[in-house]
């Protein structure tokens, strides 16, 4: 999404959530 937009995209599955969690946790260590 570009800055200034309203983003309403829904993920059809929870599978990709694992990748998001992983990325979020990786940021913690920065």
């Amino acid at each position: 999404s570009s800055t200034g937009s309203i983003d309403m995209v829904d993920s059809p599955q929870l599978a990709t959530l694992a990748d998001e969690v992983s990325a979020s946790l990786a940021k913690q260590g920065l």
Partner: antibody
Amino acid sequence: QVQLQESGPSLVKPSQTLSLTCTVSGFSVISDSVAWVRQAPGKVPEWLGASGSSGNKYYNPALKSRLSITRDTSKSQVSLSLSSVTTEDTAVYYCARGIIAGVDVWGRGLLVSVSS
Amino acid sequence: QAVLTQPSSVSGALGQRVSITCSGSSSNVGYGDYVGWYQQVPGSAPKLLIYGAASRASGVPDRFSGSRSGNTATLTISSLQAEDEADYYCASYDSSDGGVFGSGTRLTVLG
């Protein structure tokens, strides 16, 4: 510094839609995920869903039919909408940076009561 | 009903070592190091202590540590302080439910 603040009505009538907004500062809702968590009085926290940094939205399957999460990048806001509320939806609603296992900064929370 | 099981209460004396367990399944705790631990004082928002099962969050004293083995995660406080008295929750990614919290543990510090 990183901050999140929930806003919205503190009282909602049964069968109506609960709408809350989380306004963030100190980070970008584009590059970081924002989760919504609620906690009924005296109960355990419950994960509602999240707006991922990818732009995808993720929902608690038990609530997915009633729940909608949207992200407005221009206002640094993530909003939550919960339809057809009942008294069981009375809780403190939190937004927080992260998704579930590493939610590092939380809003103060907003107590929403569902009552006629 | 919480998917992750914790003891409802634990207690220990000042300076004592205590551990809180969080038992789940292969779809959550056993899925990987996607586990966090939170401390909550009544009336306040949860505070992140441990992320990624074993990493201490910024500013958290080193007396707090976390580990995971199979479907069980453990939070250990090596030397109890009076200010540690609070409720503790584990939380995990769940491949079916998205995100789940534990049943919660009330920690009481004695004496």
